[in-house]
Interface confidence: medium
């Protein structure tokens, strides 16, 4: 059987089965998701579940630019430092810079400190570039 | 292919009303914002109207808010505009256009980007 | 809000246009550019700033940083010759630019 490659919408570019949208256009982070939802096909605001997803979307946007932090769909709804990814997918793998994880941060953003390897948390209303996942 | 056809353009007196269609095909409409733009003679494009996907959502430029209504029959696939109280200044070519992408839900985070354009209707509003 | 853009641009065959759009903090926008030749209907030929529909030449390409995008057609074609328009999505309406008419001499 010959097996198609799903194909993802214009712009956005394709690994694993997933198709990812990088975004950069300033956005607090639930305007953010708000957009990432706009697009349909049940799309998010990226969930990140392994290190080989992480250097795969590291790669992509470090083509673009390498110093701005960029939102992903991991968020701390409750102010408790219970994470959870917008998109419901489970909270395994993680990727903290071991900055700090306290005050007033309950979004999290890939840090362009390590080549968008590692996390960081950020006040939410903080506007920035974002990252969009969906599965086609 | 994707396809949009406008009708319904015509001579219309100051005053009179005009209803135009745009019958689309070959994409699953209920799932795109459409609007309409139009263009006066030897003049730029002006955005006119726009709905979302569901019909749940309209918006419209400031020159026609009162007079024009946009709606939208996802069972007969097409898309509508009716124009009341027309004035001269609004003869031109109306083109019913598809969003870039599909967006639900269409509102807040999102924004509207007129992708694939129909041929485009005449109205001439003229006593 | 408003887009302004310059009426016309001359290039000679094989030349870069460079066709501008400024708007109040432009760079928050997202910038569409669309080509509309007489007697047609407008094509979209760059989305989100400086994306670009797989029909349309790669010697299309768009930018935007600032209060200005810019709309870019390197070794420009007789075919170029048209209007451009950028558009952008601001508080419920789209707007569009008054165009520009590019000549190709």
């Known amino acids: 059987d010959i097996i198609m490659r799903p194909s993802c919408a214009p712009g956005w570019f394709y690994h694993k089965s997933n198709c990812y949208g990088y975004f950069r256009k300033l956005r607090n982070w639930s305007d953010a998701e708000l957009e990432c939802q706009s697009y349909g096909n049940g799309a998010h605001l990226a969930s990140i579940l392994s290190l080989k997803e992480a250097s795969t979307i590291a790669e992509y946007i470090s083509g673009y630019q390498r110093s701005q932090p960029i939102w992903i769909g991991l968020h701390d709804p409750q102010k408790r430092q219970q994470w959870q990814w917008i998109d419901g997918a489970m909270y395994l793998y993680r990727s903290w810079s071991g900055k700090s994880m306290g005050g007033n941060k309950h979004c999290a953003e890939m840090s362009s400190n390590n080549n968008f390897l590692t996390w960081s948390s950020n006040e939410c209303n903080k506007r920035q570039h974002f990252l969009c996942k969906y599965r086609p | 292919e994707v396809q949009l056809l406008e009708s319904g353009g015509g001579l219309v007196q100051p005053g009179g009303s005009l209803r135009l269609s745009c019958a689309a095909s070959?994409?699953?409409?209920?799932?795109?914002?459409m609007s309409w733009v139009r263009q006066a003679p030897g003049k730029g494009l002006e955005w006119v109207s726009a709905?979302?996907?569901?019909?749940?959502?309209?918006y419209y430029a400031d020159s026609v808010k009162g007079r024009f209504t946009i709606s939208r029959d996802n069972s007969k696939n097409t898309l509508y505009l009716q124009m009341n109280s027309l004035r001269a200044e609004d003869t031109a070519v109306y083109y019913c256009?598809?969003?870039?992408?599909?967006?639900?839900?269409f509102g807040s985070g999102s924004y509207l980007n007129p992708f694939d354009w129909g041929q485009g209707t005449m109205v001439t509003v003229s006593s | 809000y408003e887009l302004t853009q310059p009426p016309s641009v001359s290039v000679s065959p094989g030349q870069t246009a460079s066709i501008t759009c400024t708007g109040d903090k432009l760079a928050e926008k997202y910038v569409s550019w669309y080509q509309q030749k007489t007697g047609r209907s407008p094509v979209l030929v760059i989305y989100q700033d400086d994306r670009r529909p797989s029909e349309i030449p790669e010697r299309f390409s768009g930018s935007n940083s600032g209060n200005t995008a810019t709309l870019t057609v390197s070794g420009a074609q007789s075919m170029d010759e048209a209007d451009y328009y950028c558009?952008?999505?601001?508080?419920?309406?789209?707007?569009f630019g008054g165009g520009t008419k590019v000549t190709v001499l």
């Open positions: 709905i979302s996907g569901s019909g749940g959502s309209t």
């Open positions: 070959g994409f699953t409409f209920s799932s795109y914002a």
């Open positions: 256009a598809r969003d870039r992408v599909r967006r639900v839900p």
């Open positions: 558009q952008v999505w601001d508080s419920n309406t789209v707007i």
